[in-house]
Amino acid sequence: SYQVICRDEKTQMIYQQHQSWLRPVLRSNRVEYCWCNSGRAQCHSVPVKSCSEPRCFNGGTCQQALYFSDFVCQCPEGFAGKCCEIDTRATCYEDQGISYRGTWSTAESGAECTNWNSSALAQKPYSGRRPDAIRLGLGNHNYCRNPDRDSKPWCYVFKAGKYSSEFCSTPACSEGNSDCYFGNGSAYRGTHSLTESGASCLPWNSMILIGKVYTAQNPSAQALGLGKHNYCRNPDGDAKPWCHVLKNRRLTWEYCDVPSCSTCGLRQYSQPQFRIKGGLFADIASHPWQAAIFAKHRRSPGERFLCGGILISSCWILSAAHCFQERFPPHHLTVILGRTYRVVPGEEEQKFEVEKYIVHKEFDDDTYDNDIALLQLKSDSSRCAQESSVVRTVCLPPADLQLPDWTECELSGYGKHEALSPFYSERLKEAHVRLYPSSRCTSQHLLNRTVTDNMLCAGDTRSGGPQANLHDACQGDSGGPLVCLNDGRMTLVGIISWGLGCGQKDVPGVYTKVTNYLDWIRDNMRP
């Protein structure tokens, strides 16, 4: 039966009709009492006092209501949940993930996990209603957990009309014997010992390091991974693993050449709630590789939205060459990652200036052949974008990737809803399209426009009358991603390039074929 529920937008927790709860007010000491009434949360401030017994984990501050028994935890940065039991910074799981308390909420199939408190799970062996729920990491959230000592974190998903368990796509911290690091690498315990410049690391117990803080003599050396070796480590929470080196007889330090373990193409997808002409409104967490490129124009003040882009590594964005025909100076460009609303700053967004950009030298501005460009983000270190739930790289395809004709893929962007609209979308949109066979991606299918082997076609194949809302890219989406699921990860197949109108029946959009440019991309991203 259909149930009215409330979703607390601040915490993403769900509540039944007439259920009440307390919530802390961000950046203040106030606490609000909320009540779920006809699907809407009604909240007002209530007086609170310190809790009589500790109830919050991870250093959370406990406050209880003055006139009734509920309590609320003010969590320190990096923690969330009713009892601050959720580690929002956990990027991967250790061993089987029994102790995993991160925020990954996507199953291997790409489906969104169901909230453990959902009444639909009441009869399941594991739900947030269990008396030992907190100990098992279950509660009013939909994050992947492993409460039954299975092989890895899992969750319940709704498919084929019922709720069933499915393993999650949460990254594992140690992928076999692959020597790479997750996050900032503070947990890295591998054996790389060369810096980015090729210099050899000094042993952490070297006499030369006397007087330095991070050495094998540090009281916390063992916990920090320092010892009688010269392996790269990150004992101080820096951007990535590093080590001490001697350069020209001078003691200094350098970042290491340890590769970061790829979390590319993994995302926490949430089902779009709103249809819109040409697609569906989406959250940036569903497309964390989506970039928004803005440009300052010589003739007009301020910045204006230029094109989409795609994050393919910490410091590199892929886009379409035709976006840069005005030959903007790099310092006139800005790239924004992690933004859901096109011109409204996001809470977790990351903003970058552009160091340089490279347009394919054989780009043809008549036919849009070789419609590809690379932008290097400006940064003080070798890292630019910091991985988060809203900022993550897409996977580049293997050179031999051949997806079957009519594979369903998706694109995203801040472009117009329809060709004749004067405005770009105010919010990120996604569209679901299918890959056309090459026999249907020819000049004769596209009003005799030139179609080259460097292009591919994709479009909405649903039938429908003149009022059908067919999904497609549109003006302003250019430079953005066309991604398809491959080996459990979203993989970049095309760059939004051109089309005839938007969302017309039997007229596909045209995309730059990324597999043709893998060597070009790698060549231009060289240090």
């Epitope: 050449d257 340089k356 030298k361 060597d519």
Partner: antibody, heavy 114, light 112 residues
Framework: QVQLVQSGAEVKKPGASVKVSCKAS??????INWVRQATGQGLEWMGR????????GYAQKFQGRVTMTRNTSISTAYMELSSLRSEDTAVYYC?????????WGQGTLVTVSS | DVVMTQSPLSLPVTPGEPASISCRSS???????????LDWYLQKPGQSPQLLIY???NRASGVPDRFSGSGSGTDFTLKISRVEAEDVGVYYC?????????FGGGTKVEIK
Amino acid sequence: QVQLVQSGAEVKKPGASVKVSCKASGNTSYWINWVRQATGQGLEWMGRIDPGGGSTGYAQKFQGRVTMTRNTSISTAYMELSSLRSEDTAVYYCASYYYAMAYWGQGTLVTVSS
Amino acid sequence: DVVMTQSPLSLPVTPGEPASISCRSSQSIVHSNGNTYLDWYLQKPGQSPQLLIYKVSNRASGVPDRFSGSGSGTDFTLKISRVEAEDVGVYYCFQGSHVPWTFGGGTKVEIK
């Protein structure tokens, strides 16, 4: 430290093919390049492969005759040269490229003789 | 293809004395990403080549500071401030900016 270990010497007849392997340890995410050197001659670049995605770039001179592949599960790159002729007799090196070809294999001598 | 021309072909040296090798490219070897991928390699007798200098002037790990590289555009130089007996072998310049990547013909350095 990256280490590259190549397969052993080969003797082939003209018109045949040869496949040389190069096993990498350490950071295996760098390009693998293939360079050859005929006896008493200089170095000649043949092409490169990205061990991750498998994308390749070949010198025009070898296009159509050379195929570079990789097996990521065993961190090994391969260079196959077909339609061999006597002038292909050389030592074939693999070299790992990050900012330059900093690490080289020990070389594999391929002799083409009837 | 970019042709890399090295001179001299042969360089007899006295230990302790300086030495210099020149390398000229047939066109600019500035890559489209702004970097100049001009490297120097040394191949000692019976060994695989080894990297000395990368991107014109950067010394590779473990390379003695008597080796230095310089140049821009199409003209590049490798200098050895004081030659040692272990420096003998064939020195190659190399451009990795334009495909096909190409090596110079080599300069043989030998002790007088």
